[in-house]
């Protein structure tokens, strides 16, 4: 439709976004086989009635819990990686590191990644034209609540060492504006979760700074601190190379320092 | 079948006020993007202002900018043109429109009309 | 502002011909969804404009087949292929790809 017709600043519910997310569904199920159980209709029913007829800047976590219900899943609490701004790499680690698991990599996680979606008040339509901006128009749209809610359950799951990936190349590190800083980091169970330990992945090549000084890591290491969390940063200063090293760890050259 | 009927027009000195209003039935009110346009005597279409299904986001024609102001109750399936500081010009015939989804009108009132005259 | 601009202004058809009346837009109107927002609208005297085409060249329900609407990107046509007495009024087109919507000046269609 015509720009100043699009009811909001975001882009519109990504194009045959339902038969995706079935289709996701059933893939993961035939992929996974302890969610084989998973009847990828009444998911798809329950995602769909999160927001479809409701205000897309009116969603509440509420909404999600028919589908949370539905894709509940147990992941090793002590295998978890989280991520800020370098989901590529992470979802990349764990695809090599496969006892691994970023929230992608769970069945509702992977439903949505990437995709986007909102309703509208009052009509069965889905509003493939716009979608609230999170900045721009509200913060309560279903794509951000949707990513709230199961970033939140993901890190309460957690326990033991939780690893996060964090970019380096970013002026802020670690955000407390992101999913991670908002969300992850004030849910991780500090009666379950011993050490946080952010890996930061440097960007360029002769890039030898040591990031863990970064103040953004400071702030981030007192806020878990203050949790009664340990905290523990690596710079990962090749990570083509770790990549590398985590497929054929008995490489020679991957006794250095990555 | 679609119907929309607007009321409120009259007579009004220039500088006075007038509210004008679209009752809607046989379709879900809600739903829908909202127009005015108006016909001044023996003249052409002049569209005047929009408002989105909810009420959210408002636009306006630059000759009735800060004058006019479009609204409308979702719970009464009513949409209103508030029109003050009215001038000659603007004596028209005001009809309310149903948006077709893409900014064209599928549906149209029989149009109210509005005289500013001293 | 996109100006719209109709020739004729006005037109007189014997029944049973055809008639043709164009619209230019001073700038395309064509979107990047692919749709080219321009309608048809026929006012009929003592009554309130009714939609014809929408996009370019589909009719709306319950318009007469014997209506049919052509053109791309700031050149646009309306024809109606045998005239017939309920025909009468004016024609305008509009846009609607950019605020304000603006309508042509219309076409004003008699029956000889």
């Known amino acids: 439709v015509p720009r100043w017709r699009q009811q909001w600043s975001g882009p519109g519910t990504t194009k045959r976004f339902p038969e995706t997310v079935l289709a996701r569904c059933v893939k993961y199920t035939e992929i996974h086989p302890e969610m084989r159980h998973v009847d990828c209709q009444s998911v798809w029913d329950a995602f769909k009635g999160a927001f479809i007829s409701k205000h897309p800047c009116n969603i509440t976590e509420e909404d999600y819990q028919p589908l949370m219900k539905l894709g509940t899943q147990t992941v090793p609490c002590n295998k978890i990686l989280l991520w800020s701004r370098i989901k590529d790499l992470a979802h990349q680690f764990t695809q090599v590191q496969r006892d691994m698991f970023t929230l992608e990599d769970t069945l509702l996680g992977y439903l949505a990644d990437d995709l986007t979606w909102c309703g509208e008040f009052n009509t069965s339509k889905i509003n493939y034209q716009s979608c609230p901006d999170w900045r721009k128009d509200c913060s309560n749209n279903p794509v951000s609540v949707f990513w709230k809610t199961v970033s939140r359950r993901f890190a309460e799951a957690a326990c033991d060492v939780v690893h996060v990936m964090l970019n380096g190349s970013r002026s802020k590190i670690f955000d407390k504006n992101s999913t991670f800083g908002s969300v992850e980091v004030h849910n991780l169970q500090p009666e379950k979760v011993q050490t946080l330990e952010a890996w930061v992945i440097h960007g360029g090549r002769e890039d030898s700074r040591d990031l863990c000084q970064d103040p953004t890591i400071k702030e981030l290491e007192s806020i878990i601190s203050k949790r009664n969390i340990q905290f523990s940063c690596k710079n990962i200063y090749r990570p083509d190379k770790f990549l590398q090293c985590v497929k054929n760890p008995e490489d020679s050259s991957c006794t250095s320092e990555i | 079948e679609v119907q929309l009927v607007e009321s409120g027009g009259g007579s009004v000195q220039p500088g006075g006020s007038l509210r004008l209003s679209c009752a809607a039935s046989?379709?879900?009110?809600?739903?829908?993007?909202m127009h005015w346009v108006r016909q001044a005597p023996g003249k052409g279409l002049e569209w005047v202002a929009v408002?989105?299904?909810?009420?959210?986001?408002?636009y306006y024609a630059d000759s009735v900018k800060g004058r006019f102001t479009i609204s409308r109750d979702n719970s009464k399936n009513t949409l209103y043109l508030q029109m003050n500081s009215l001038r000659a010009e603007d004596t028209a015939v005001y009809y309310c429109?149903?948006?077709?989804?893409?900014?064209?009108?599928?549906?149209w009132g029989q149009g109210t009309l509005v005289t500013v005259s001293s | 502002d996109i100006v719209m601009t109709h020739t004729p202004l006005s037109l007189s058809v014997t029944p049973g011909q055809p008639a043709s009346i164009s619209c230019k837009s001073s700038?395309?109107?064509?979107?990047?969804?692919?749709?080219?927002?321009l309608y048809w609208y026929l006012q009929k005297p003592g009554q309130p404009p009714q939609l014809l085409i929408y996009?370019?060249?589909n009719r709306f329900s319950g318009v007469p087949d014997r209506y049919s609407g052509s053109g791309s990107g700031t050149d646009f046509t309306l024809k109606i292929s045998r005239v017939e007495a309920e025909d009468v009024g004016v024609y305008y087109c509009m846009q609607s790809i950019q605020l304000p919507l603006t309508f042509g000046g219309g076409t004003k269609l008699e029956i000889k």
């Open positions: 408002i989105s299904y909810d009420g959210a986001k408002k």
């Open positions: 996009e370019v060249s």
């Open positions: 429109a149903r948006d077709d989804g893409s900014g064209g009108f599928d549906y």
């Open positions: 046989e379709f879900t009110f809600s739903s829908y993007w």
């Open positions: 700038q395309s109107l064509l979107h990047s969804d692919g749709k080219t927002y």
